[in-house]
């Protein structure tokens, strides 16, 4: 069955049951996600606007899918397996009486079960498992996943120690001068450089030592966390931001309406599900898209892919690859490639690496 092909997953609570305080709903859902993040490399972040991976909905009766709820009792909730659109979404029957305790239906316990489905788990035949198909109240203060639940989820995502690249369990601000720091995406925006990581971005103004950290949502509330690639076309005052199979267009620092759009509108084949890194070269008026160990070249004037791509990164960028995390263009001469905590200054005219740096070298660390 399907799984999320990333470790950083967003959720959004679309609406709140009147049965509970909003804070109690937030807490129950947050703790339910935490149950699964404790035993996997997955990290969950709540967003309040825009498109989340997992939408949490309280609804009664017919509510926009094929599986209308049935009134009090019976079906308590359902959730869709990982995927785009409705994929991952968890629906809770508003005709139940949702609670923080043993009376009515406990939201936390039900949410743990449904989030299991949202992550790709099916039902378990072990009556002690939270993924057993029938609801049974257990003391939420001593609640633990069964061995079967843990085995199931780790068979899909592995255990927490496989998450060395995401050392940020509580979404706190990453330490800027951590020698192991890596970035999700980097791009110039005018005379500034934006460094994206999780929910955050750092702003480096050229030639100034000072850097400021910001929440992505504080600048662009409609954008998701975990931006994976970015590039700028400075002459048009445009910045393109990528996450999963979607991209957003920012013009003059403002998000354009009618976005996100599919990355496939650039002409990528179906198997491309996300972009690792992207960079625009104004000399050639071409954008380079890096996906796993390959790259594509896109003609921004003709708005189409150049023929003969993809090509292997290692073949055409000597010393770079096989995969990269981020890249940006600077000084009319260099690409700066980021791989984990390392960075490579690459002269695209000489076609070779001219300097090796730490990824956070821009911050005077």
């Amino acid at each position: 069955g399907p799984v999320w092909r990333k470790h950083y997953i967003t959720y959004r609570i679309n609406n709140y049951t009147p049965d509970m305080n909003r804070e109690d709903v937030d807490y129950a859902i947050r703790k339910a996600f935490q149950v699964w993040s404790n035993v996997t490399p997955l990290k969950f972040s709540k967003i309040n606007t825009g498109m989340a991976d997992i939408l949490v909905v309280f609804a009664r009766g017919a509510h926009g899918d094929f599986h209308a709820f049935d009134g009090k009792g019976g079906i308590l909730a359902h959730a869709f397996g990982p995927g785009s659109g409705i994929g991952g979404d968890a629906h809770f029957d508003e005709d139940e009486f949702w609670t923080t305790h043993s009376g009515g239906t406990n939201l936390f316990l039900t949410a743990v079960h449904e989030i299991g489905h949202s992550l790709g788990l099916g039902h378990s035949s072990d009556p002690k498992a939270v993924m057993f198909p029938t609801y049974k109240y257990v003391d939420i203060n001593t609640f633990r996943l069964s061995a079967d639940d843990i085995r199931g989820i780790q068979s899909l995502y592995g255990d927490p120690k496989e998450n060395q690249r995401l050392p940020n369990p509580d979404n706190s601000e990453p330490a800027l001068c951590d020698p192991n720091l890596s970035f999700d995406a980097v791009t110039t925006v005018g005379n500034k450089i934006f460094f994206f990581k999780d929910r955050f971005f750092w702003l480096k103004v050229s030639e100034r030592p000072k850097t400021s950290v910001n929440l992505i949502s504080s600048l662009w509330p409609t954008l998701p966390s975990g931006i994976e690639a970015a590039y700028e076309i400075e002459a048009r005052n445009q910045v393109f931001l990528f996450k999963d199979d979607k991209y957003w267009l920012i013009s003059n620092l403002r998000p354009e309406p009618n976005y996100p759009k599919s990355i496939h509108s650039f002409g990528f084949p179906n198997f491309v599900k996300k972009i690792d890194a992207a960079v625009f070269n104004p000399r050639f008026y071409r954008t380079y898209f890096f996906v796993d160990n390959q790259y594509w070249r896109y003609d921004e004037r003709r708005q189409m892919m150049d023929p003969g791509y993809p090509k292997l990164i290692t073949k055409n960028f000597q010393g770079i690859g096989p995969k990269i995390d981020a890249v940006f263009y600077s000084k009319n001469k260099y690409y700066y490639f980021f791989q984990g905590s390392n960075q490579f200054e690459y002269d695209f005219l000489l076609q070779r690496i001219t300097k090796t740096l730490k990824s956070n070298s821009w911050f005077g660390c």
Partner: antibody, heavy 122, light 103 residues
Framework: EVQLLESGGGLVQPGGSLRLSCAAS????????MHWVRQAPGKGLEWVSG????????IYADSVKGRFTISRDNSKNTLYLQMNSLRAEDTAVYYC???????????????WGRGTLVTVSS | DIQMTQSPSSLSASVGDRVTITCRAN??????LNWYQQKPGKAPELLIY???SLQSGVPSRFSGSGSGTDFTLTISSLQPEDFATYYC?????FGQGTKLEIK
Amino acid sequence: EVQLLESGGGLVQPGGSLRLSCAASGFTFSPYWMHWVRQAPGKGLEWVSGISPSGGETIYADSVKGRFTISRDNSKNTLYLQMNSLRAEDTAVYYCARDIWGAYASGLFDYWGRGTLVTVSS
Amino acid sequence: DIQMTQSPSSLSASVGDRVTITCRANQSIYTYLNWYQQKPGKAPELLIYAASSLQSGVPSRFSGSGSGTDFTLTISSLQPEDFATYYCQQAGIFGQGTKLEIK
């Protein structure tokens, strides 16, 4: 390449029966919800029925409930629609369509067959 | 029960025009709305899913927006191959369709 090919349509009298088939190829059939959608001549689209990956759950439009039965044979990569007690208003092109995979039907139909025409007339 | 109302039912436009088709639900369907294009004698094709996500291979002149009860499909600059019938859909319910014709 994903392909869905319907067959079994034809002319049938009111009250008669017909069995439609949809042969799937180019993808792993068993994890997907599958559906039938129909279109009467010159009219819009109407969802008819859907079936879960295992075949254990079936759903129907009110207009066909009790008369039509959807089924599937995952070993043959084939979807079926058994239509009984046919009426003139069942005259339509019948399309099979693939839904998202998983425990629940999403209604996101990413691939469709070309359709097969069913005409109910005396 | 949920109902979908699509408008207009037909529309005449010229190549290069910007065209908007709307779809309204009688209750919130969140972003669970898809758009399909159908040409005469052909099967429908998925254009937009989840209200605003462009299906793979669909030109970027097509875009979708909306959530809750009100949704729109926009074609930014009509091409000759875009003249067809468009349907919005949510689970088992389709809109009545909008026939887009050449002016």
